[in-house]
Amino acid sequence: IWELKKDVYVVELDWYPDAPGEMVVLTCDTPEEDGITWTLDQSSEVLGSGKTLTIQVKEFGDAGQYTCHKGGEVLSHSLLLLHKKEDGIWSTDILKDQKEPKNKTFLRCEAKNYSGRFTCWWLTTISTDLTFSVKSSRGSSDPQGVTCGAATLSAERVRGDNKEYEYSVECQEDSACPAAEESLPIEVMVDAVHKLKYENYTSSFFIRDIIKPDPPKNLQLKPLKNSRQVEVSWEYPDTWSTPHSYFSLTFCVQVQGKSKREKKDRVFTDKTSATVICRKNASISVRAQDRYYSSSWSEWASVPCS
Amino acid sequence: RNLPVATPDPGMFPCLHHSQNLLRAVSNMLQKARQTLEFYPCTSEEIDHEDITKDKTSTVEACLPLELTKNESCLNSRETSFITNGSCLASRKTSFMMALCLSSIYEDLKMYQVEFKTMNAKLLMDPKRQIFLDQNMLAVIDELMQALNFNSETVPQKSSLEEPDFYKTKIKLCILLHAFRIRAVTIDRVMSYLNAS
């Protein structure tokens, strides 16, 4: 058993048939010695009396908020949560496996630049009685500070018969140098509590590997005289690291017909303009990627040819 | 990536072309190592990230873009010392810091060159003959060093009398390639920045 936060404890349980469970002794936080009674959750029925209460925790129903009272007055609370281990593996029932980029990916993170700011998100089908708490650091032994906000519900989607909920959190490395060469990864730890079930999820990454620039901005077309060609121009996204001559991007320009089956013409360039042939009913799209370190491409920015 | 490769203009900052070739060569070598050594811990997640230049050079700090010198997190250990101009600085009014920066890059390349050559000698003794260093990568390091043209003592190649542990050597190769790729990215950024200045 260990303390998650003040008055909240996690009981780690090996889950198998006939498991003996864990004996837990709760002590009422009071100088009083006599006349103490114990209740569980919001029930008024007395479970036991005395300064300590011994319980055998075997399953979820044995957990909950144990309260000690004296003469109708609440003295202290202890909330017990369960962390379940089956066949040596901690349960991962609360979050959905996103399977990208590999199996058992519960947390996904992205950064728009090298400022040390990043966003992580996760999915669940659970809609109520759910809380998350996020901690992060650079490195695990002798960790350096990363500050994370509160996790918030960022999207809801319907997937078949199920509703899916996306939660996200923003974190910022306390003293980040955009030009630094990372040697220690960022560690992100998410504590998830659903009803009386506790689970924890972790992700480890370098900012350079989770970079995904915003799409190029101000995408414009300029027809060239006496030609089917157009000059496409764009700018670096506002959120990209500066100076741009140091944090350079490379671009992919695509001409796509109305039909998805039509052949796509693609040009790669390091410049912020390109000359392409604009077909009728086609659209021109541009996306960006770090020029020197091939992490993710941005989403496309698009304009119609007409 | 199937990018069309632009040939540099003659007037272009001379080292930019070499640094682009360097990054391409080390990325290809790393990819080859990861494929060939697929049953070894050779991915970014599996290896320990070591920097052989740590405490010996200060490329990131010395080559920091002017715009980032206001960022206190970038100024942990800025060095300000000596160094004479190399040929990459040809016909340019070069600041003291720029000379320091390019000299630091040169020292990095020299250290990696020695490590890679020593390692290659060991890998050539491996009866499995599983992996060797790409001669093109070694050549590209050499070319960039020549372009930088700093006067520096030559470091003798390390030789070891003991029987090499090929498993450890291959893991060390992965560690070295990962670190060198990261440094090659920094070098490319620096050259691009200097070219634009």
């Epitope: 569980l40 959750d41 919001q42 029925e45 399953e59 979820f60 957990a63 379940k84 | -």
Partner: nanobody, 124 residues
């Protein structure tokens, strides 16, 4: 999902005893409490007894206190209701129910899963 199957009901004389069983299967580890409710002819659903977890807490309706005992064999995922000193007014269909809710375990509206019920008749 949790499936519940009751057994052990039947006809018994006043003052007699019966033991009801409720076997749970499926995602039983998600359940917080298991309880017994009953419905007499022409009446609403009435709370009888509930057991929390593996038995850290048991709650009873006033009308059955001292006569009925709820217990659980966690290894068999089975909950029992031992009914002694039965009275005619205990005649009802007895339902086993399971909840994933921590609170209001005496209220049938908080229960997620129900068995099909077993008839208990107390008559001479």
């Amino acid at each position: 999902e949790v499936q519940l199957v009751e057994s052990g009901g039947g006809l018994v004389q006043p003052g007699g005893s019966l033991r009801l069983s409720c076997a749970a299967s499926g995602r039983t580890f998600e359940t917080i409490a298991m309880g017994w409710f009953r419905q007499a002819p022409g009446k609403g659903l009435e709370f009888v007894a509930v057991i929390r977890g593996s038995g850290v807490a048991t709650y009873y309706a006033e009308s059955v206190k001292g006569r009925f005992t709820i217990s659980k064999d966690s290894s068999k995922n089975t909950v029992y209701l031992q009914m002694n000193s039965l009275r005619a007014e205990d005649t009802a269909v007895y339902y086993c129910a399971a909840t994933t809710n921590r609170f209001k375990n005496r209220e049938y509206t908080t229960y997620d899963y129900w068995g099909q019920g077993t008839q208990v008749t107390v008559s001479s």
